[in-house]
C-alpha cells in the first residue's frame, strides 16, 4: 500500500500518486515565421509547429497562437533553443571605421503570462552580444530551468529580432515544457 | 487508491504506476577519441565513458559502441555538452587578408537511429560559426530537450570535427538521457 | 497492480512509490555579490536568492551560505546559467598591437562537496574564451545534467571572475536542481 514505507515504522503522508505517462508535456519545433505586428519595446513572440515531425503536445498541454497553455498547476521544466544567423553585424563595420560601439545583440526570453499578474513575467533570458567579423555568422542560445506554474498560465518565446531566427530545421530551434 | 482522485468524483484511468528509481538513466562522459572511419557527408560519432567517475548507466539503459540503447518506450530528456577548442580559425586569417569568407563552424548533433525509420533522425543540433581572432579559442555547445523514443532506439552524439573536441575533463563534454 | 509487469511473467520488485510533488526541488536566482575572500587557484562561489521572485526551495531542499543542501539520496538534474558581461577584453587590445595572446576566458563550474570525499568534485564546467572587439560584451553559459547525489551533499556554482557576473536580472543568472 502506498504510504506504508518499508524502512521507517511511522506512517508517511504523500500527495496523491499519478502515473508519469499522463503528465502534461510538449516539444515544439520551429516554423517559418510570418511577420506579425508587435508593440515597440516588446520582443516579438515565435510561433511553433506542435504536431508534425518531432513536435508533440500531450496530456492536455495545448499549443495555440504562440502560447503553450499550462493545464495543471505544478513544477515544470521549461526549455528552448533558438539558433540565430545573420550577415556581418553593424558593430564590426563601425569598428572597422575606428569607432568602438555598443555591439549588436541577440536575445531569447521565455515569458509567462498569468491571470494573477498584470505584467508578463520573464522566466528565462539568454542574451549575447554579436560582434562577428566573418561575413556570415550563426549561433544558438539555449535556456532551461524549473518553475512553479499555475493552471491557465501561458508560456511563449520572445526574440530580439525575428528575422535572424533560423527556421530551416526542427532540431535547431525548439521550445518545450514538461510537468515534473 | 490510485485512480480514485480526490477532486473530481468520476473515476480516472491511469497508466500503471512505477517507482522513479527504476527508470532508465545514463550520464556519459568524454574519453579520448580514437580516430574511426566515418562515411563522407556524415559527422563522426563520439564514444563515451559509461562507468568511471561521474558516468553511469542504470535500469537497463546500456551503452555500447557509441550508442545509448533505449530499453523502454517513453518520453526522455536527452542532453549533451561538447566543449570545442582550437587554434585561430582559418576564417580570421583570411579576414586579415581583407577577404571576408564563410566562417568556420562547430556543430553538435544528437542523432536517433530507429528500426522504424530508414534514416537517422537528427533530434538536436547546436551549430556555431567560429571566427576567433585570439591564438587559441574554446567554447561549449549545450543541447537538451524531450523526445518520445521507442524501445530499441539508439542515440549518439555526432560532431563536425572530432579533433576539436576537448576530451580532457569529464565535466566539459558529456551526454545523458533519462526517462521522464 | 504495481509490480506485476505485462510482458514478463515473473514478479518484479520495485522501490517504494512516491508522489512527485514531494520531491526536493530548488530554483535559485542571482543577487548582487558581496566580495568574499576566496583561496588562490579556487574560483569564487556565487550566492543566491532562494525565496523572492522566481526563486524557491521546497521539500527539504535548503539553501544556505552559497550551498544547495541535498536532503535525500537519488538522481538529480542540476542546472545553471551565468550571464557574464564586461568591457573589451585585454586579448583584443594586445591583438591590435600585433601580438597574439592566450585569450581571456569565462568559466562556470557546478561543484559538489561531499562528506565522503576530501576534495570538491567538479560536476559540470562551461568555459569559453572571450576575445570580443566591441567595447561591451555579454553572453551566457548554460549547464545542465543528471548526477547521483547522496544525502548531505552540497552544491555550489563557481565562476572564474565574480565581477563579470550579470546580477541585474533573475532570469539571466540562476541555479537549480530537482530530484528525478
Amino acid at each position: 500500500l502506498k504510504g506504508q514505507e518499508f524502512a521507517p515504522s511511522h506512517q508517511q503522508v504523500y500527495a496523491p500518486l499519478r502515473a508519469d505517462g499522463d503528465k502534461p508535456r510538449a516539444h515544439l519545433t520551429v516554423v517559418r515565421q510570418t511577420p506579425t505586428q508587435h508593440f515597440k519595446n516588446q520582443f516579438p513572440a515565435l510561433h511553433w509547429e506542435h504536431e508534425l515531425g518531432l513536435a508533440f503536445t500531450k496530456n492536455r498541454m495545448n499549443y495555440t497562437n504562440k502560447f503553450l497553455l499550462i493545464p495543471e498547476s505544478g513544477d515544470y521544466f521549461i526549455y528552448s533553443q533558438v539558433t540565430f544567423r545573420g550577415m556581418t553585424s553593424e558593430c564590426s563595420e563601425i569598428r572597422q571605421a575606428g569607432r568602438p560601439n555598443k555591439p549588436d545583440s541577440i536575445t531569447v526570453v521565455i515569458t509567462k503570462v498569468t491571470d494573477s499578474y498584470p505584467e508578463p513575467t520573464q522566466l528565462l533570458m539568454g542574451t549575447k552580444s554579436v560582434c562577428e567579423v566573418g561575413s556570415n555568422w550563426f549561433q544558438p542560445i539555449y535556456l532551461g530551468a524549473m518553475f512553479s506554474l499555475q493552471e491557465g498560465d501561458k508560456l511563449m518565446v520572445n526574440v530580439s529580432d525575428i528575422s535572424l531566427v533560423d527556421y530551416t530545421k526542427e532540431d535547431k530551434t525548439f521550445f518545450g515544457a514538461f510537468l515534473l | 487508491l490510485k485512480g480514485q482522485e480526490f477532486a473530481p468524483s468520476h473515476q480516472q484511468v491511469y497508466a500503471p504506476l512505477r517507482a522513479d528509481g527504476d527508470k532508465p538513466r545514463a550520464h556519459l562522459t568524454v574519453v579520448r577519441q580514437t580516430p574511426t572511419q566515418h562515411f563522407k557527408n556524415q559527422f563522426p560519432a563520439l564514444h563515451w565513458e559509461h562507468e568511471l567517475g561521474l558516468a553511469f548507466t542504470k535500469n537497463r539503459m546500456n551503452y555500447t559502441n557509441k550508442f545509448l540503447l533505449i530499453p523502454e518506450s517513453g518520453d526522455y530528456f536527452i542532453y549533451s555538452q561538447v566543449t570545442f577548442r582550437g587554434m585561430t580559425s582559418e576564417c580570421s586569417e583570411i579576414r586579415q587578408a581583407g577577404r571576408p569568407n564563410k566562417p568556420d563552424s562547430i556543430t553538435v548533433v544528437i542523432t536517433k537511429v530507429t528500426d522504424s525509420y530508414p534514416e537517422p533522425t537528427q533530434l538536436l543540433m547546436g551549430t556555431k560559426s567560429v571566427c576567433e581572432v585570439g591564438s587559441n579559442w574554446f567554447q561549449p555547445i549545450y543541447l537538451g530537450a524531450m523526445f518520445s523514443l521507442q524501445e530499441g532506439d539508439k542515440l549518439m552524439v555526432n560532431v563536425s570535427d572530432i579533433s576539436l573536441v576537448d576530451y580532457t575533463k569529464e565535466d566539459k563534454t558529456f551526454f545523458g538521457a533519462f526517462l521522464l | 497492480l504495481k509490480g506485476q509487469e505485462f510482458a514478463p511473467s515473473h514478479q518484479q520488485v520495485y522501490a517504494p512509490l512516491r508522489a512527485d510533488g514531494d520531491k526536493p526541488r530548488a530554483h535559485l536566482t542571482v543577487v548582487r555579490q558581496t566580495p568574499t575572500q576566496h583561496f588562490k587557484n579556487q574560483f569564487p562561489a556565487l550566492h543566491w536568492e532562494h525565496e523572492l521572485g522566481l526563486a524557491f526551495t521546497k521539500n527539504r531542499m535548503n539553501y544556505t551560505n552559497k550551498f544547495l543542501l541535498i536532503p535525500e539520496s537519488g538522481d538529480y538534474f542540476i542546472y545553471s546559467q551565468v550571464t557574464f558581461r564586461g568591457m573589451t577584453s585585454e586579448c583584443s587590445e594586445i591583438r591590435q598591437a600585433g601580438r597574439p595572446n592566450k585569450p581571456d576566458s569565462i568559466t562556470v563550474v557546478i561543484t559538489k562537496v561531499t562528506d565522503s570525499y576530501p576534495e570538491p568534485t567538479q560536476l559540470l564546467m562551461g568555459t569559453k574564451s572571450v576575445c570580443e572587439v566591441g567595447s561591451n560584451w555579454f553572453q551566457p553559459i548554460y549547464l545542465g545534467a543528471m548526477f547521483s547525489l547522496q544525502e548531505g551533499d552540497k552544491l555550489m556554482v563557481n565562476v572564474s571572475d565574480i565581477s563579470l557576473v550579470d546580477y541585474t536580472k533573475e532570469d539571466k543568472t540562476f541555479f537549480g536542481a530537482f530530484l528525478l
Epitope: - | 572511419q37 562515411f39 560519432a45 546500456n62 555500447t64 559502441n65 557509441k66 550508442f67 540503447l69 537511429v113 530507429t114 528500426d115 522504424s116 525509420y117 530508414p118 534514416e119 537517422p120 530499441g152 539508439k154 | -
Partner: antibody
C-alpha cells in the same frame, strides 16, 4: 558502397534447421539494424525479425518466434538467420535488409528450397 | 498484428497515365513505406515516412496519407515502372507488408 550478400545451402531437408549468413560491407553494421525478410513463391513479403548489431537485441515475428533465431558477429560483419523445424512451406527467397541508415539496402536474396 | 490492405491487387494502365495505389492499415501508424519489386530482384525502397522520396528515385513517384489511409502515386507511368508495389508499416510487431499491387502496361 553498401553491399549485403546472403549465403547458405540452397536445399534443406524437412524438420532440419535452415541457416543463412548475411555478410555486409560499406557501412558500420552497429550503426543500423539488420532484418530478415522472406518471400515465398508467388506470395508477398514476410518480415521475420531483426537484430540490433550494436547490442544484440532482437525482435521476431510472433508467428515465427518459436523457430527463428537471429545472431550477429560484428567482427566478421555478419548476421545469421536460423529457422528450425522447417517444412515445405518455408521454401522461399530469404533477404537480408538494413534499416536505420539511408539508403535502405537489401541483399539480392537467397533461394532456399525445403525438400526431401 | 497490424493488417495492411492494399488495393487494387493489379492494374493495367497506359504510358503517361497517373497511377494510384492505396494502402489501409488496421490501426494508425506514423510511417508508411512503399517498395518496388521487379521480377527476380530484391524490393527497392521508393517512399519512406509516408511522403519522403528515397535517394535516386524519380520525382514521378510520390506518397501521401497519415493514420490509417495512405496513397502511392506514379504521376506519369513509364515502361520501366512495370513491377509489383508493396506498402509496409515498420512500427507494430510484426512489421507487415501489403499483399502487393502488380502494375502492367496496357
Amino acid at each position: 558502397q553498401v553491399q549485403l550478400q546472403e549465403s547458405g545451402p540452397g536445399l534443406v531437408r524437412p524438420s532440419q534447421t535452415l541457416s543463412l549468413t548475411c555478410t555486409v560491407s560499406g557501412f558500420d553494421m552497429g550503426d543500423t539494424y539488420m532484418h530478415w525478410v522472406r518471400q515465398r513463391p508467388g506470395r508477398g513479403l514476410e518480415w521475420m525479425g531483426r537484430i540490433d548489431p550494436a547490442s544484440g537485441h532482437t525482435k521476431y515475428n510472433p508467428s515465427l518466434k518459436s523457430r527463428v533465431t537471429i545472431t550477429r558477429d560484428t567482427s566478421k560483419n555478419q548476421v545469421s538467420l536460423r529457422l528450425s523445424s522447417v517444412t515445405a512451406a518455408d521454401t522461399a527467397v530469404y533477404y537480408c535488409v538494413r534499416s536505420g541508415g539511408m539508403p535502405d539496402a537489401w541483399g539480392q536474396g537467397s533461394l532456399v528450397t525445403v525438400s526431401s | 498484428d497490424i493488417q495492411m490492405t492494399q488495393s487494387p491487387s493489379s492494374l493495367s494502365a497506359s504510358v503517361g497515365d497517373r497511377v494510384t495505389i492505396t494502402c489501409r492499415a488496421s490501426q494508425g501508424v506514423r510511417y508508411m513505406y512503399w517498395y518496388q519489386q521487379k521480377p527476380g530482384k530484391a524490393p527497392k525502397l521508393l517512399i519512406y515516412g509516408a511522403s519522403n522520396l528515397a535517394s535516386g528515385v524519380p520525382s514521378r513517384f510520390s506518397g501521401s496519407g497519415s493514420g490509417t489511409d495512405f496513397t502511392f502515386t506514379i504521376s506519369s507511368l513509364q515502361p520501366e515502372d512495370i513491377a509489383t508495389y508493396y506498402c509496409q508499416q515498420w512500427e507494430g510487431n510484426p512489421r507487415t507488408f501489403g499483399q502487393g499491387t502488380k502494375v502492367e502496361i496496357k
